[in-house]
Structures are given as structure tokens and as C-alpha cells.
């Protein structure tokens, strides 16, 4: 019988008492085969973290700063359940740390030196740790003691709780630096008042502070937010302009064997029975013998943290950067206006080898990072382990939802001004063998299908989106008799046709021979009835253009396209017989890397792009013998996006809507995690 006990860690007598009450009340409402609570008492949160890591306890609820400590080795804990505030309909699990300024003040984030600052309090998250952590490498050296460096950075401050004797500049705007509400500039409202009164130029608070202090929109309009990309935005656009997105209070558990499903089962049942306004005798979110015991008194309930979410993703790149800077106190040697090498994310061994070749030839401008799947790469870019990669539109969508931005687009047509003219897109098509003359768009049910990969544009999002509109369910593996759609569940019929060996079967990378455009076409040639690819795939792999044994004798005339009206046409008539227009693949990165990725990639394509005539004697960035490694092989150049610099603008309303509709069929664990952070 599996042990269904969750050992909760308590950090005080009062918490232990509430934990015992929690345990007893849960026993009275949950059947004996259900989850139960045991209580473990420790002296501090850090002791609780160590106890969970050592398997002496299972769970504890922590503030963001401690979630970071819990994640660090050797603890390796992960967030499993989040408290939410507000209503069940609009649950708030995060707050945003923001920098508020007056509208007419005219400076940006990178011009804060010499300004006057208002802080909620020394050592507090939104008011100190996050802004000072993010500004850390701009502080004058020596950066220790930190208070002295901050005092020398700003021309005056109010940082309640600072030592006014040792650091008088930190108390210049609020004499005495009192550490309670007796100091009119203490806390969130106090720091905002410090700005409002004109004492300071910038206030570091949370996004709700301004709404709580100014009910009138006209008054709020006198203020703006400073964004990390050195722009400003209105105060209600905090989701797109903040210093960090911070989780409020989170239950953590072990990453391996951490009982996360059991903890959720327990807390979900607990909130049903003892949540807000549920029971008189025991209340989960109430602390008669103290404040915020086990859970925050202001919490309204729990939400399960998606399993794909590790602590780094949950806390977010900005928060982790800020806290790491403060804790480790290390800054890059290089002057900050110089671009560091771009860390390119490569999928599997084939891409890594090409990336390494690029790295050597780039003379230190490009470094390489490996991941097994596109989603793993996106996650690495999010958390700073990697910086950039080129993605199919379907993954540009996921990357965009995860906060990444498109920076350059692949262009596939030769033109005089390639780099300045991003193209309208390519065509997603359905290819069949000419010999299968009875096959049309209307009778694909029960046939064998070949897809580039799950989540990709031409191979999945467009055909499956159209199919979904017809069949109104997501069981695509029942619609086709079998197929190869790399990235499907291994036991799915949509992995049956795949050719990868062992663990590589149906993997969404080049270890699966039927992956990508060329792979999906090969799947059609060897086993399938229909392949969902791009309009250039057939000509690129026929007529001797692909020398691989399976392709070298293929003839374009032996294949036809399925049109949506139920007819068929020759391959070259794709403009009048396609499923949809697809946005070109694009390079994505984090917002903070946008300028450097743009600059370095434009240099790199001038060195190794289509202008290189002899690819047998020189490194060519856009060539890999039809394998589309790192970039599509038919890329002519990487083009500027001009104003199409967000994922929505880049992909276009129609495509975003189409992928959004298919979201209910999504198996993307990363998309689930990212929409948890930003619904």
C-alpha cells in the first residue's frame, strides 16, 4: 500500500499547533485510503528545506526568496502548489515588482544613476532586492557593503530599516529611516507617497500599489512604469513592463519522488473542506494564534503548478538574475555595452555538430548549448542558459507565450534587398503519391499520415487545426490509422510509422529519421499516404537534389497536392492548392538580448550566409544537406522585422487565432507552464 502521508513542515510552536489541527480535521473528512497529514517541526524555513531534501519532511510553503534557496543545490526542491489571492475567477498567484516614475520626468531605467529613490524597506522583495539586484552590476565599485554602493549610486534615498548612522544618504528622503508605519514613507504606500510628494524620482513598489493609492484613472495617468528595455509604459501595462514577476507564496517539494500529486490531492481536498468560507471549526487560511501560519491568511485557495515548471521558470529570469546578483555578487568583466557571445540552442547531436562548427568559425561570437527538444531549448532561453534559436511559427507562438521575442525572420526568396524585406510566408501543403489517385482532402480518415512534428506549423498546427474544425475533437490518433508525428506520446498510433531506433523513436529532433520537412516527406515516400509539409519540400528532395539513397531517384511528377476543395493539383501549383499560408521561421531570444542577437547574427550572415559561393570549402550557415539544421536550408537571409517585433505581430492575427483554437488539443507542457505565469 503506498504511503499517502504528506509530512508538513512547521517552523514554530504556533505553526505546529495549527498543523496538528489541520491533520485532525483532515482525518475527519477524508476516507482512510485518502491523503493524510503528519507534522514535522523545525527551527526555521531553511531547516525545513533541508529536511524535505533529506526526505524527513515533504512540504512547506515559502516566500519567493526562499523558493530560490530551496531550488539551489543540494536542496533541488521545486514548486508544486501556489497560493492564489483575489477571486477564483481571476486568481492572482504572482505580483509584479515595478519602478514607478512621474510622467514628465524623462529618464529611463539605464539613467537611474544620480536620481532619488524610494524603497519599501531594506531587504524587501519589490522595494529593494529586485531593483537593487537588477541594478547590481551598474553600482559603483566596491559593491560591498551593498548599502554604501547604493547610497553612492542614487543621489539620495528613503530605504526604511537602513542604518541611518552608517548610511545617511539612504535616509536622506525620510530622516531616521524608521522601520514601521510611523515612517510616512515606509512600505508600499509609503514608497509611493515618497514619489508622489516629490521627495523621490522613482519608487520601487508592486503593481497594485498605484491602484490602491490612486482610485482615479486621471491621477494614475500622471505616472508611468520604467521598463527593462529602457522604454516607459502606462501603469496598467505592468504585465509588459516590470522588473520581475514574483510568486507570492508557494508549496515546495522534492524534484524527484516529491509526492507532488499527493500534495495537490491533499491541498485540493483541504480547500474544498476548509478553504475560504467553508468551515467554522477549522480554517486553512486563518491564524488565530498568530499570522500567516502554514499559509498566508490572505490566500483564497490553491492552484496546481504545472509539472514542467521548475523553480527557475517559476521565479522567472529577472527575479533569478536579481537574487543571484545579490547573493553571488559577481559581475561580468566586459564593459556592458559590448555584446557577449550569443549562446545558440542546438537540438540533438546533428545540430550540435553544425553549431560547434559555426562556433569555431565565428571566432568566439557564437557558443553552443544542447537540448533534446525544441521546448527544452525554449526553456533554456527563458532561464538564460541559452540565448537564441530559429523556430517554426508554431514554436514562435509558444516562445512568445513564454515571454520571448522574435528578432529576425528567415527569408526564402532571393531579392535585391533580402535583409530589409521580411516575406509574407510560405505555403503549408498536403502531399500524396500520384498513384493513390482516389485520395482527397475529404477522405483522409483511416489513412497513414506524416507530420514534421507536433506543434509545428505546416506539419501540425495548420492541418490539425483544419481537421479539428471538421471533427470537433482532439483525437487525431483515432482519425488517422497510424502515422509519424514526432513529439506524440510514444504509445500513440501517431508514433507507429516513425523510424527512430529505441529511445529516439518519435522524438522531435533529427535522431528520428522522419522528423522535420524532409523526414515527413521521406515518411510519405516509404510508408505513408499523406505528408504535411511546406511547398518547397517536394522540389528540394526530388530530381536528384537530395543525394541520400531514399531520395536520389525520386521524381516530382510522382506527387500531387490535396486542395481544400477536394481536388488535386500538381506540386508546382501550390499557390492555388495549399492549406494555408504559414509565417516564416524566425529567430527568438529574450528581450534583454534582442539588440545583441540582432547585431551578431547580422554580422554572422554577412560572413557565412548565402553570399558564400563554395560551401564545400567554407562554412555555410544556411546549408546542411536538406536536414534544416539550425536554420532551414532554403534560407537566403535573416531579415529585419521592422515593427513586427512581438510574437502576435509577427505571426499575424489569423495564425495566432488558429493556434489558440488548437490550444485545447495542445500537449505542450511548456505552453501550460507559461500560461500559468501569464494566463
Amino acid at each position: 500500500v503506498p504511503d499517502k502521508t504528506v509530512r508538513w513542515c512547521a517552523v514554530s510552536e504556533h505553526e505546529a499547533t495549527k498543523c496538528q489541527s489541520f491533520r485532525d480535521h483532515m482525518k475527519s473528512v477524508i476516507p482512510s485510503d485518502g491523503p493524510s497529514v503528519a507534522c514535522v517541526k523545525k527551527a526555521s524555513y531553511l531547516d525545513c528545506i533541508r529536511a524535505i531534501a533529506a526526505n524527513e519532511a515533504d512540504a512547506v510553503t515559502l516566500d519567493a526568496g526562499l523558493v530560490y534557496d530551496a531550488y539551489l543545490a543540494p536542496n533541488n526542491l521545486k514548486p508544486v502548489v501556489a497560493e492564489f489571492y483575489g477571486s477564483k475567477e481571476d486568481p492572482q498567484t504572482f505580483y509584479y515588482a515595478v519602478a514607478v516614475v512621474k510622467k514628465d520626468s524623462g529618464f529611463q531605467m539605464n539613467q537611474l544613476r544620480g536620481k532619488k529613490s524610494c524603497h519599501t524597506g531594506l531587504g524587501r522583495s519589490a522595494g529593494w532586492n529586485i531593483p537593487i539586484g537588477l541594478l547590481y552590476c551598474d553600482l559603483p565599485e566596491p559593491r560591498k557593503p551593498l548599502e554604501k554602493a547604493v547610497a553612492n549610486f542614487f543621489s539620495g534615498s528613503c530605504a526604511p530599516c537602513a542604518d541611518g548612522t552608517d548610511f545617511p544618504q539612504l535616509c536622506q528622503l525620510c530622516p531616521g529611516c524608521g522601520c514601521s508605519t510611523l515612517n510616512q514613507y515606509f512600505g508600499y504606500s509609503g514608497a509611493f507617497k515618497c514619489l508622489k510628494d516629490g521627495a523621490g524620482d522613482v519608487a520601487f513598489v508592486k503593481h497594485s500599489t498605484i491602484f490602491e493609492n490612486l482610485a482615479n484613472k486621471a491621477d494614475r495617468d500622471q505616472y508611468e512604469l520604467l521598463c527593462l528595455d529602457n522604454t516607459r509604459k502606462p501603469v496598467d501595462e505592468y504585465k509588459d513592463c516590470h522588473l520581475a514577476q514574483v510568486p507570492s507564496h508557494t508549496v515546495v517539494a522534492r524534484s524527484m519522488g516529491g509526492k507532488e500529486d499527493l500534495i495537490w490531492e491533499l491541498l485540493n481536498q483541504a480547500q474544498e473542506h476548509f478553504g475560504k468560507d467553508k468551515s467554522k471549526e477549522f480554517q486553512l487560511f486563518s491564524s488565530p494564534h498568530g499570522k500567516d501560519l502554514l499559509f498566508k491568511d490572505s490566500a483564497h485557495g490553491f492552484l496546481k503548478v504545472p509539472p514542467r515548471m521548475d523553480a527557475k521558470m517559476y521565479l522567472g529570469y529577472e527575479y533569478v538574475t536579481a537574487i543571484r546578483n545579490l547573493r553571488e555578487g559577481t559581475c561580468p568583466e566586459a564593459p556592458t555595452d559590448e555584446c557577449k557571445p550569443v549562446k545558440w540552442c542546438a537540438l540533438s547531436h546533428h545540430e550540435r555538430l553544425k553549431c560547434d562548427e559555426w562556433s569555431v568559425n565565428s571566432v568566439g561570437k557564437i557558443e553552443c548549448v544542447s537540448a533534446e527538444t525544441t521546448e527544452d531549448c525554449i526553456a533554456k532561453i527563458m532561464n538564460g542558459e541559452a540565448d537564441a534559436m530559429s523556430l517554426d511559427g508554431g514554436f514562435v507562438y509558444i516562445a512568445g507565450k513564454c515571454g520571448l521575442v522574435p528578432v529576425l525572420a528567415e527569408n526564402y526568396n532571393k531579392s535585391d534587398n533580402c535583409e530589409d524585406t521580411p516575406e509574407a510566408g510560405y505555403f503549408a501543403i498536403a502531399v500524396v503519391k500520384k498513384s493513390a489517385s482516389d485520395l482527397t482532402w475529404d477522405n483522409l480518415k483511416g489513412k497513414k499520415s506524416c507530420h514534421t512534428a507536433v506543434g509545428r506549423t505546416a506539419g501540425w498546427n495548420i492541418p490539425m487545426g483544419l481537421l479539428y474544425n471538421k471533427i470537433n475533437h482532439c483525437r487525431f490518433d483515432e482519425f488517422f490509422s497510424e502515422g509519424c508525428a514526432p513529439g506524440s506520446k510514444k504509445d500513440s498510433s501517431l508514433c507507429k510509422l516513425c523510424m527512430g531506433s529505441g529511445l529516439n523513436l518519435c522524438e522531435p529532433n533529427n535522431k528520428e529519421g522522419y522528423y522535420g520537412y524532409t523526414g515527413a516527406f521521406r515518411c510519405l515516400v516509404e510508408k505513408g499516404d499523406v505528408a504535411f509539409v511546406k511547398h518547397q519540400t517536394v522540389p528540394q528532395n526530388t530530381g536528384g537534389k537530395n543525394p541520400d539513397p531514399w531520395a536520389k531517384n525520386l521524381n516530382e511528377k510522382d506527387y500531387e497536392l490535396l486542395c481544400l476543395d477536394g481536388t488535386r493539383k500538381p506540386v508546382e501549383e501550390y499557390a492555388n492548392c495549399h492549406l494555408a499560408r504559414a509565417p516564416n521561421h524566425a529567430v527568438v531570444t529574450r528581450k534583454d538580448k534582442e539588440a545583441c542577437v540582432h547585431k551578431i547574427l547580422r554580422q554572422q550572415q554577412h560572413l557565412f550566409g548565402s553570399n558564400v559561393t563554395d560551401c564545400s570549402g567554407n562554412f555555410c550557415l544556411f546549408r546542411s544537406e536538406t536536414k534544416d539544421l539550425l536554420f532551414r536550408d532554403d534560407t537566403v537571409c535573416l531579415a529585419k522585422l521592422h515593427d513586427r517585433n512581438t510574437y502576435e505581430k509577427y505571426l499575424g492575427e489569423e495564425y495566432v487565432k488558429a493556434v489558440g483554437n488548437l490550444r485545447k488539443c495542445s500537449t505542450s507542457s511548456l505552453l501550460e507552464a507559461c500560461t500559468f505565469r501569464r494566463p
Epitope: 560547434d356 568559425n361 571566432v363
Partner: nanobody, 112 residues
Framework: QVQLVESGGGLVQPGGSLRLSCVAS????????VIWYRQAPGKRRELVAL???????NYRESVKGRFTISRDDAKNTVWLQMNALEPEDTGVYYC??????FGQGTQVTVSS
């Protein structure tokens, strides 16, 4: 001007071994890494192995576990130790570093 000279090739039976060397004249050799390529008759030139300045190495899948690339900066030399050779390894082997043209290469023939 740095020049690269490859040597160590020859005729060897399947299962045999060879050690290729790539020697550079001039200074600053391999500061950004060195790559061994090979070209079989009628085929495209393909990357075999590479070594970066920090000692990081990578290999094409078909030679992994059989070939080892190493370097000695004091001798301005990069080696390619090739074991368990197969007929498919036949070709002209070249070493390359950024900014330096290809050398003459060294012929490796694996045949019984």
C-alpha cells in the same frame, strides 16, 4: 601567414588504426579551434571532429568512440587518432582553422 600541413595517412586494413597530425607554421594556431574534415571520392566534404581552444571536442556520429581528437599547443599540432577503421572512413582528410586556407590533406584508404 599560417599554413597547415596534414600527415599520417596511408593504406590500412579494416579494424586497423592510424594517427593523423596537423601541424601549423606560424603563431596563434587553433586559438579558435581546429576542425578535421574528410572528402570521399564523388562525395561532399564532411566534418569528422573538432576541438576548441578550451579542449571541448565533438565528433560526427559515425566515428564517435573510434576517433579521438587532441591538441598540443606547444607543438602547434592537432592529432586525430583513428581506431577500428572501416572502409567508409576512406577519403582525403584535411584540418582547418578559421582564416587559414585548406592544406593538401592526407589520403586515408581502408581496404582489405
Amino acid at each position: 601567414q599560417v599554413q597547415l600541413v596534414e600527415s599520417g595517412g596511408g593504406l590500412v586494413q579494416p579494424g586497423g588504426s592510424l594517427r593523423l597530425s596537423c601541424v601549423a607554421s606560424g603563431s596563434g594556431f587553433g586559438i579558435n579551434g581546429v576542425i578535421w574534415y574528410r572528402q570521399a571520392p564523388g562525395k561532399r566534404r564532411e566534418l569528422v571532429a573538432l576541438i576548441k581552444s578550451d579542449g571541448y571536442t565533438n565528433y560526427r556520429e559515425s566515428v564517435k568512440g573510434r576517433f579521438t581528437i587532441s591538441r598540443d599547443d606547444a607543438k602547434n599540432t592537432v592529432w586525430l587518432q583513428m581506431n577500428a577503421l572501416e572502409p567508409e572512413d576512406t577519403g582525403v582528410y584535411y584540418c582547418k582553422t578559421p582564416g587559414v586556407p585548406f592544406g593538401q590533406g592526407t589520403q586515408v584508404t581502408v581496404s582489405s
